[in-house]
């Protein structure tokens, strides 16, 4: 007699996760008398997957009717697929006994689940990092199957070389996780700028998704401090300002010492946005020179951002200098940050 | 081609729990069974029990109450975790990939770790 | 459990002369598949076992074909065509029929 064949035509089917996955079996012969079960895996840990006789398999159903009379096909359909389905599917027949025994196998069919991967999310550094510095951002997306994706960063629409990618596990697996490291160099214009992490996965159509990170999150522009006499008033007043600019972000307190003792400290707060997202802003201090006997030394003191405070410093000459009685060309730059501003005294 | 690497403490206190990983590099986890197998000093081999790609074990009755053997197919790693040791604990441990086929089932362990030695001593 | 017994336990060897170890099992290997559930292994010396026999009779990849395997049911032979040097160290049978999976005891191949 012709030797029974299991035959399993499909060596892999491939299905997107929540379809249908239909598996086929044929079987050569109605003889000997038996069932046929099919497993998931092989050996003794091999998984039930259906089994006409007896159990409940509320996802899988028999694709045609295995109790019509000379019924040969025992393929099956399994319902709402996930990743945790993939595997290799083997329709066995038993011959009919106590216990039944196992008899044949077919070759097998690999299941694999197309699943989409998550959304990227993009995380930037934990703490702020000045201008000229390079930071790390990294973008996570999981879940998704098969194995091979495509990812890309860019910044403000170039893509970024500096990168490592890896993608979890290295062998074969339900759904796969990737990972992504991207080194931005920072720069004082990129208060605006914006970093998209792009995925492309045979699941998408060819519509990658994006995760996105403003810089805005991860700089701090320092600021500039600039100190200038504005004016020698007539009655002995020095207008003496502190431009502090292009800084990022707001926070930021100022305070003017005189002769080293606190004279005003002042916070910023909904200050206008500089076209490149920076801010600006400007205090005065008024002076009264002949309230002085001594030279008066007056610090403006900037503390951005939590960051060490910075300093820059004028010294006020109270001397009887007529001729440059409102002056205000006559400033030296010392080696300190002090601006030297000789006002007379009138 | 498939390697495997086992690692852990070469020396374990009498009564403690006895900790081995093995990673499985150059291939994948599924379809096979991993199994731990020791050899005491000068002794034959004894197999201590496998784990399947779906996560099921079987252990040898011998040791069962003691032994416990996991996998994280995500690190492509499977472990050995042993309770209460003793000196006849001593022994090469190797984790070992075995084959199988529908319809056959168990066909051969054909890939082995080059082994680790763990001593119980106080 | 299944018992497995080797002998004999040392077999010194001649380079180019034949060499067969047996193995017995407390009950049948053959199962209804018409399959042999026993495998052979080869353990040089400090290294790692490493498949020769699977199945009974079918050599695993890489191994030589002076290597064969033969019996059915609880009655094995592992036989070596022609020994090479290489081919000494300790020879293990070992049934994968059920679980708790049993070798025997082992038979140190060694040149005279």
């Known amino acids: 007699e012709e030797e029974l064949q299991v035959i399993q035509p499909e060596k892999s089917v491939s299905v997107a996760a929540g379809d249908s996955a239909t598996l086929n079996c044929t079987v050569s012969s109605l003889i000997p008398v038996g069932p046929i079960q099919w497993f998931r895996g092989a050996g003794p840990g091999r998984e039930l997957i259906y089994n006409l006789k007896e159990g409940h398999f509320p996802r899988v159903t028999a694709v045609s009717d295995p109790t019509k009379r000379n019924n040969m096909d025992f393929s099956i359909r399994i319902s709402n697929i996930t990743p945790a389905d993939a595997g290799t599917y083997y329709c066995v027949k038993f011959r009919k006994g106590s216990p039944d025994v196992e008899l044949k196998s077919g070759a097998g069919t690999e299941l694999s689940v197309r699943a989409k991967p998550s959304a990227p999310v993009v995380s930037g550094p934990a703490v702020r990092a000045t201008a000229e510095h390079t930071v790390s951002f990294t973008c996570e997306s999981h879940g998704f199957s098969p194995r091979d994706i495509t990812l890309k960063w860019f910044k403000n629409g170039n893509e970024l070389s500096d990168v490592q990618t890896n993608v979890d596990p290295a062998g074969k697996s339900v759904s796969y996780s990737i990972r992504s490291t991207a080194r931005v160099l920072l720069t004082r214009r990129d208060v605006h700028s914006q970093v998209i992490c792009e995925v492309a996965h045979v699941t998408l159509q060819g519509d990658p998704l994006r995760g996105t990170a403003n810089l805005s999150e991860a700089i701090r522009v320092p600021p500039f401090l600039e100190v200038t006499q504005q004016s020698m008033r007539a009655d002995n007043q020095v207008n003496v300002t502190c431009q502090v600019t292009k800084f990022y972000p707001q926070r930021l307190q100022l305070t003017w010492l005189e002769n080293g003792n606190v004279s005003r400290t002042e916070m910023a707060s909904a200050l206008p946005e500089n076209k490149d997202g920076t801010y600006n802003w400007t205090s005065w201090l008024l002076v009264n020179v002949s309230a002085h006997r001594d030279d008066v030394k007056l610090t403006c003191q900037v503390e951005h951002d939590g960051q060490p405070a910075v300093n820059k410093s004028f010294s006020v000459k109270v001397s009887a200098h007529p001729k440059e009685q409102g002056s205000n060309t006559a400033a030296e730059n010392t080696g300190t940050n002090e601006r030297n501003i000789y006002g007379g005294s009138g | 081609q498939v390697q495997l690497q086992e690692s852990g403490p070469g020396l374990v206190r009498p009564s403690e729990t006895l900790s081995l990983t093995c990673t499985v590099s150059g291939g994948s986890i599924r379809n096979y069974y991993w199994s731990w197998i020791r050899q005491p000093p000068g002794k034959g081999l004894e197999w201590m029990g496998f784990?399947?790609?779906?996560?099921?074990?079987f252990y040898n009755p011998s040791l069962k109450s003691r032994v416990t053997i996991s996998l994280d197919m995500s690190m492509n790693q499977f472990s050995l975790k042993m309770t209460s040791v003793t000196a006849a604990d001593t022994a090469v441990y190797y984790c070992?990939?075995?084959?199988?086929?529908?319809?056959?089932?168990?066909?051969?362990?054909?890939?082995w770790g080059q082994g680790t030695t763990v001593t119980v001593s106080s | 459990d299944i018992v497995m017994t080797q002998s004999p336990l040392s077999l010194p060897v001649t380079p180019g002369e034949p060499a067969s170890i047996s193995c017995k099992s407390s009950q049948s290997l053959l199962y209804s598949n018409a399959y042999n559930y026993l495998d052979w292994y080869l353990q040089r010396p400090g290294q790692s076992p490493q498949l020769l026999i699977y199945?009974?009779?079918n050599r695993a990849s890489g191994v030589p074909d002076r290597f064969s395997g033969s019996g059915s049911g609880t009655d094995f032979t592992l036989k070596i065509s022609r020994v090479e040097a290489e081919d000494v160290g300790v020879y293990y049978c070992?049934?994968?029929?059920?679980?708790?999976?049993?070798f025997g005891g082992g038979t140190k191949v060694e040149i005279k």
């Open positions: 070992a990939r075995v084959r199988a086929y529908s319809g056959i089932g168990l066909d051969g362990t054909d890939v």
């Open positions: 070992m049934q994968a029929l059920q679980t708790p999976l049993t």
């Open positions: 784990i399947y790609d779906n996560g099921r074990t």
């Open positions: 199945l009974g009779s």
